[in-house]
C-alpha cells in the first residue's frame, strides 16, 4: 500500500517531452548548474517517501516551472500544456492517496524537495524554468522506476 498507482500514460508524456527536449535544452546556458539531474537526493529516496516526493515534484513543476516558463513557440507550448495537464491528473490521483493516508511526508522527503527548490532559486527565473524543463526526463525516469505505472485506456 505504500506505493500509489499513477494511472497516467507515461509513454505519452515521454513522447511529448522527446519532441521538445532539444528545443528547450538548446536555450540552457548553465552547464555547471543542475536542478534535478544526477541528484543523489532522488536516487536514495526510500519507498516510504516516493509518494510524497512525487507529489512535491509535481507541485514544483505545475506551480513553478510551467508558470515561470514563457514559451513563444505555439507548437512547443501545446506540448508543454499537454505535459502540464498530465501532471495535474497525476496530482489528482495522488490526492486520493493522501486521503487514504498513504502519502505521508517524512523529513527526508521534505529535504529532497527543498534541495530542488534551492537549486531553482539560484538561477534567474527564466533560466531556472528552462533548465528544469530540460531535466524533465530525470523526473519522468524516476517516476517510471519508483511507481507501478498503470497505463490508462
Amino acid at each position: 500500500l505504500r506505493r500509489c498507482l499513477i494511472s497516467t500514460d507515461m509513454h505519452h508524456i515521454e513522447e511529448s517531452f522527446q519532441e521538445i527536449k532539444r528545443a528547450i535544452q538548446a536555450k540552457d546556458t548553465f552547464p555547471n548548474v543542475t536542478i534535478l539531474s544526477t541528484l543523489e537526493t532522488l536516487q536514495i529516496i526510500k519507498p516510504l517517501d516516493v509518494c510524497c516526493v512525487t507529489k512535491n515534484l509535481l507541485a514544483f513543476y505545475v506551480d513553478r516551472v510551467f508558470k515561470d516558463h514563457q514559451e513563444p513557440n505555439p507548437k512547443i507550448l501545446r506540448k508543454i500544456s499537454s505535459i502540464a495537464n498530465s501532471f495535474l491528473y497525476m496530482q489528482k490521483t495522488l490526492r486520493q492517496c493522501q486521503e487514504q493516508r498513504q502519502c505521508h511526508c517524512r523529513q527526508e522527503a521534505t529535504n529532497a524537495t527543498r534541495v530542488i527548490h534551492d537549486n531553482y532559486d539560484q538561477l534567474e527565473v527564466h533560466a531556472a524554468a528552462i533548465k528544469s524543463l530540460g531535466e524533465l526526463d530525470v523526473f519522468l525516469a524516476w517516476i517510471n522506476k519508483n511507481h507501478e505505472v498503470m497505463f490508462s485506456a
Epitope: Q18, E19, I20, K21, R22, A23, Q25, A26, K27, D28, T29, F30, P31, N32, N73, K75, I76, K79, G134
Partner: antibody, heavy 120, light 111 residues
Framework: QQLEESGGGLVQPEGSLTLTCTAS?????????ICWVRQAPGKGLEWLAC????????TYYANWAKGRFTISKTSSTTVTLQMTSLTAADTATYFC?????????????WGPGTLVTVSS | DVVMTQTPASVEAAVGGTVTIKCQAS??????LAWYQQKPGQPPKLLIY???KLASGVPSRFKGSGSGTQFTLTISDLECADAATYYC?????????????FGGGTEVVVK
C-alpha cells in the same frame, strides 16, 4: 540507419550551391539535431549549422555562417544547406551529422561527406 | 563562445605504448566533452562522450577523463590502427556552446 550528403562539386567563386542530407533507416519526423560540419583539406572540423527536425524547427548557425548559409528541413528524410557567395575559403568536405550535441550524442551518426570545391 | 584548445598538435609513439591528448575549454563545460577519431577520407568516429563514457564498440584502451575546463584522452596499448587524427568537442546541449566547439585536432603517428 544512415545519412548521406549529396550536391557537392565544383562551383565558381561568388556562386551558390545547395547540399542535401538524406536519411535512410529513420526519418526526420521525430526530433533530432541535424547539423552540418565542414572540414577544409588538411584542416580541422568546423561546425556550421543545426536544425531541430521536431516540432520547433529551430535553427542555429555559427557566427561566421549567418547570412550566407541556410539550413532547412525539406522533407521527412531530407535536410538541405543552401550556400551563397562562395569563396575559395569555403572549399571543404561538408558532413551532415545527427545529434552531435546534447545527451543523445551516444546515438549520433555522420554521413561520409561531400566535397565542395570553389574555384574558377 | 567557448573555445576548445587541443594539445599537442602531433604526437608519435610506438606500438604498445601510451598516448595522452589534452583538451582545454575556455570556460567550464561540466562533463559535456566528446572525443572523436578520424582517418583520412572518413567521417569522425565517436570514441568518448560525457568526458569519460565509452561509445558503443570502442575498446577500453581508450579512456577519457576530466571535467570543467581540463580533459584528457589516453590511448594505451597502441595499435597501428590507432594512427589517426583525434578531436575533442564540447557537446553541451546549450546552443551558445556550439560555435568553436571542436578542438584543433591531434595527429597520432604510430611507429
Amino acid at each position: 540507419q544512415q545519412l548521406e550528403e549529396s550536391g557537392g562539386g565544383l562551383v565558381q567563386p561568388e556562386g551558390s550551391l545547395t547540399l542535401t542530407c538524406t536519411a535512410s533507416g529513420f526519418s526526420f519526423s521525430s526530433s533530432y539535431w541535424i547539423c552540418w560540419v565542414r572540414q577544409a583539406p588538411g584542416k580541422g572540423l568546423e561546425w556550421l549549422a543545426c536544425i531541430d527536425t521536431g516540432v520547433s524547427g529551430d535553427t542555429y548557425y555559427a557566427n561566421w555562417a549567418k547570412g550566407r548559409f541556410t539550413i532547412s528541413k525539406t522533407s521527412s528524410t531530407t535536410v538541405t544547406l543552401q550556400m551563397t557567395s562562395l569563396t575559395a575559403a569555403d572549399t571543404a568536405t561538408y558532413f551532415c551529422a545527427r545529434d552531435i550535441f546534447g545527451s543523445a550524442i551516444d546515438n549520433s551518426l555522420w554521413g561520409p561527406g561531400t566535397l565542395v570545391t570553389v574555384s574558377s | 563562445d567557448v573555445v576548445m584548445t587541443q594539445t599537442p598538435a602531433s604526437v608519435e609513439a610506438a606500438v604498445g605504448g601510451t598516448v595522452t591528448i589534452k583538451c582545454q575549454a575556455s570556460e567550464s563545460i561540466g562533463n559535456a566533452l566528446a572525443w572523436y577519431q578520424q582517418k583520412p577520407g572518413q567521417p569522425p568516429k565517436l570514441l568518448i562522450y560525457d568526458a569519460s563514457k565509452l561509445a558503443s564498440g570502442v575498446p577500453s584502451r581508450f579512456k577519457g577523463s576530466g571535467s570543467g575546463t581540463q580533459f584528457t584522452l589516453t590511448i594505451s596499448d597502441l595499435e597501428c590502427a590507432d594512427a589517426a587524427t583525434y578531436y575533442c568537442q564540447c557537446h553541451y546541449h546549450g546552443s551558445s556552446y556550439w560555435d568553436n566547439s571542436f578542438g584543433g585536432g591531434t595527429e597520432v603517428v604510430v611507429k
